[in-house]
């Protein structure tokens, strides 16, 4: 399960991005004097940084553009979907159930006739 631990963080980072994008889109047409879009852009950059950290296989010092980060995220999501689509391992059987009829079957009854050889 540890291998999938980044998923929650990744999900939050993606939500973070989408919320910020939505806020910027809604903010268009407002007075350019408001400082909100600038702080939102800072937040988006923070979200991209979080995403870059969460996607496996990206060396720490690597510089990636926002498009490259998103592409890596998409690839990672697709990989996770493939893993989740595979059937999960299952048990060999259910718990042992006793037979309710307690009759001894003829072939398992101990023979009283102990001959020294069998025909």
């Amino acid at each position: 399960m540890k291998a999938l631990s980044p998923v929650r963080g990744c999900y939050e980072a993606v939500c973070c991005l989408s919320e910020r994008s939505l806020a910027i889109a809604r903010g268009r047409g407002k007075s350019p004097s408001t400082e909100e879009p600038l702080s939102l852009l800072d937040d988006m950059n923070h979200c991209y940084s979080r995403l870059r950290e969460l996607v496996p296989g990206v060396p720490r010092g690597t510089q990636l553009s926002q498009v490259e980060i998103l592409q890596r995220v998409i690839d990672y999501i697709l990989d996770l979907q493939v893993v989740l689509a595979e059937p999960a391992p299952g048990p060999p059987d259910g718990p042992h159930l006793p037979i309710q009829t307690a009759e001894l079957t003829p072939e398992l009854v101990i023979s009283k006739d102990k001959r020294s050889f069998c025909h």
Partner: antibody
Framework: QSVEESGGRLVTPGTPLTLTCTAS????????IHWVRQAPGKGLEWIGY??????ARYATWAKGRFTISKTSSTTVNLKMTSLTTEDTATYFC???????WGPGTLVTVSL | AVLTQTPSPVSAAVGGTVSISCQSS????????LSWFQQKPGQPPKLLIY???KLESGVPSRFKGSGSGTQFTLTISDVQCDDAATYYC????????????FGGGTEVVVK
């Protein structure tokens, strides 16, 4: 408590065939049912099961050609396709725990 | 997984003891998910032992199962004429397929 297989007959290669396992004295809804086969003079071969939650699992060799499904609270089907002469065998169903087996039904695949 | 049993036939004298081994290529589920069956010609298999060492209801205590992981043994003591049969082991595995695998069978001949 017992199970009984039915539907076995002589078929030609390529003919699909469905076998039925019918339970008496208990319900199949909350138990696993296994299908096992035995070619004449050969050993036992596990085909697959359907679980209490209706999940079917198969032996690797049976995947794709064999389908196990619950059709009612007392019957489970084994659907077989693309039959070959190698599939000639007595087919058994067994209840969870493998302590209740049917007498078997003979499937003969021949030209 | 592959289950390898003691080659057939195995001879036993009335009143004697006979042991049949069953080796799995990988550990069975829970290290104990192994059953033993007795089968006579024209009959379905009969469960003797489940979960390595548990005796099925109605089975004489002369039948004893032991082992763990990949190596298992069925021991029949005070052998009777009626014990002449083919014995199969069945391993259970927690996997996506091949959840149950039978051994090739061991014929026991009683003299």
């Amino acid at each position: 408590q017992s199970v009984e297989e039915s539907g076995g007959r002589l078929v030609t290669p390529g003919t699909p065939l469905t076998l039925t396992c019918t339970a008496s004295g208990f319900s199949l809804s909350n138990v696993y049912i296994h299908w096992v086969r035995q070619a004449p003079g050969k050993g036992l071969e596990w085909i697959g099961y359907i679980s209490d939650g209706d999940t079917a699992r198969y032996a690797t060799w049976a995947k794709g050609r064999f389908t196990i499904s619950k059709t009612s609270s007392t019957t489970v089907n084994l659907k077989m396709t693309s039959l070959t002469t190698e599939d000639t065998a007595t087919y058994f169903c067994a209840r969870q725990g493998f302590n209740i087996w049917g007498p078997g039904t003979l499937v003969t695949v021949s030209l | 997984a592959v289950l390898t049993q003691t080659p057939s036939p195995v001879s036993a004298a009335v009143g004697g003891t006979v042991s049949i081994s069953c080796q799995s290529s990988q550990s069975v589920w829970n290290n104990n998910w192994l059953s033993w069956f007795q089968q006579k010609p024209g009959q379905p298999p009969k469960l003797l032992i489940y979960e390595t060492s548990k005796l099925e209801s109605g089975v004489p205590s002369r039948f004893k199962g032991s082992g763990s992981g990949t190596q298992f043994t069925l021991t029949i003591s005070d052998v009777q004429c009626d014990d002449a049969a083919t014995y199969y082991c069945l391993g259970g595995y927690w996997t996506t397929s091949d959840n149950n695998v039978f051994g090739g069978g061991t014929e026991v001949v009683v003299k």
